[in-house]
């Protein structure tokens, strides 16, 4: 019968040829009376057999990632009779892996959006690298992820590539971060190959800022001839948030005379002071009112940022008009 062990040949051998093993008949007594032949895909071009001994050699560099298995056939013939000594036999040559491929991030570019002020541990995104080496061959394709840039705000789980928040961030201080992740094979051991990817992490706004008046005192004037509903001036607050989180509502906090009202221009986010009742210079030539401003939408969990609404004082001077 045929005698052989399983055949393995390392990929990327830089020698001219490489001895893989021996294939022989147990009837072969070593007197060169038998001739061994190799058949099948790769015979003669990738593998050869020493026809006298049955020794098999790889005669070219192999790439496991291109082809990991060769199925060949062997024959052994008695030179004297020309007859087969053994039935033709099929055998396998496996190409064994070396760590010749670096991890690659295939889904680049990565981009994620996460709310500002998110607590530590919040999941941002998962990055995944793939390695063309054999996952069943040692640690050649076992990857470890690490953070090259992004501390102290982000961390990455070494085995999963999950990026999490490790420190709260304020969008109003910085609204985006570039995080660089490295994937290393060989679980980081010597001889490891690595690949890197960049992740753009944008912070979305939350309503963590209340509107604050630009001025603590506004001076306005109104003619005593002005009809009710007249706009006598504007006041303005600023809010570091954006979008709907910066939408605000102005209102009167204090007006003993109940002469004025404030309406909000939602286009400009300005407060418009309106005359609610006609004024008479001879009766009262100046007024003092207090206005306050609040955000339009404030989720319950963010109310802590919105205690004590900002207020401003408005002094209104009534202008005299000659009367008939």
């Amino acid at each position: 019968g045929w005698v052989w062990n399983q055949f393995f040949v390392p990929e990327e051998m830089n020698t001219t040829s490489h001895h893989i093993g021996q294939l022989r008949s147990d009837l072969d007594n070593g007197n060169n009376s038998f001739q061994y032949k190799l058949l099948g895909a790769g015979a003669g071009s990738t593998f050869i057999i020493d026809e006298r001994t049955g020794d098999i050699y790889a005669i070219q560099k192999l790439d496991r990632e291109e082809r990991s298995l060769y199925i060949l056939r062997a024959q052994v013939i008695d030179i004297a009779t020309g007859r087969a000594v053994e039935p033709e036999s099929e055998f396998v040559i496996k190409v064994s892996d070396i760590n010749d491929n670096e991890p690659k991030f295939l889904d680049e570019p990565y981009e994620a959006i996460v709310p500002e002020m998110s607590p530590e541990g919040t999941l941002v995104i998962q990055v995944t690298a793939s390695d063309a080496d054999d996952p069943s061959s040692g640690n050649n394709a076992r990857l470890l992820y690490s953070l090259l840039q992004g501390q102290p705000y982000f961390s990455v789980e070494p085995t999963t590539g999950v990026i999490r928040i490790s420190s709260k961030m304020d969008r109003e201080l910085q609204d985006e971060y570039w995080v660089i992740i490295q994937a290393k094979d060989m679980i980081g051991q010597p001889g490891a190959l690595s690949g890197t990817t960049s992740v753009l992490i944008k912070l979305s706004d939350v309503n963590d800022n209340k509107p604050i008046f630009k001025e603590s005192l506004y001076r306005l004037t109104v003619s005593e001839s002005a009809p009710t509903g007249t706009s006598i001036g504007t006041i303005m607050a600023y809010d570091n948030d954006i979008g709907e989180n910066a939408e605000m509502d102005y209102s009167i906090e204090e007006d003993d005379s109940q002469t004025f009202d404030i309406i909000t221009n939602h286009e400009t986010q300005e407060g418009i002071v309106i005359l609610k009742k006609k004024v008479d210079f001879e009766h009262q030539n100046h007024y003092g009112i207090r206005a306050k401003v609040k955000n339009h939408h404030v989720p319950e969990q963010l109310m802590k940022y919105h205690t004590e609404a900002s207020t401003t004082f408005i002094k209104i001077q009534v202008e005299d008009v000659d009367e008939p």
């Epitope: 020493d50 001994t53 050699y57």
Partner: antibody
Amino acid sequence: EVQLLESGGGLVQPGGSLRLSCAASGFTFSSYAMNWVRQAPGKGLEWVSTISGGGANTYYADSVKGRFTISSDNSKSTLYLQMNSLRAADTAVYYCAKGGMGGYYYGMDVWGQGTTVTVSS
Amino acid sequence: EIVMTQSPVTLSLSLGERATLSCRASQSISSNLAWFQQKPGQAPRLLIYGAFTRATGIPARVSGSGSGTEFTLTISSLQSEDFAVYYCQQYNYWPLTFGGGTKVEIK
């Protein structure tokens, strides 16, 4: 008996081309690697190129890469060396040599008598 | 590229004497070394391959030894037909490389 007979050498001007042939007999040509080796006048041996049996794999010395092409015709049991952009430094006796068996597959066990190539203006 | 260094360049010996030729590889080539003999006006002839295996028809007085980086060709008792130039050659790595040769001449 294994025999190798080179031909095609001669005098050629720099920049010119030449095609060497090596007719083989006495063995199964497609089962063996074949080589070209040269020897400049009064100098040692220099490997030029190798082709595996069947022609699947070819290898070249850096000094000839991109200028020389090795090939074979199994039906004629003949090895070729196409030499282009010839230089004075290519002047040599060119030998073809048969590869061996097994671990000596890329070796040189039988040599032809050589053909002379002279590159000169 | 593997550099093959032969020594001595010339060896002057008498008939019947022992000739010892050395060949050193710049890095390990296992046992993938061959020795060739070349006489003036002739093609090289294979003597030894696999560092120590004699080629067909080579007499027993010719022997090879060594592995890795250090190799030796020994001719135990020089005959008149042994006076020639000897080359070592590695076939472990591409490009295949030859040593510069050792000339064995009659003293």
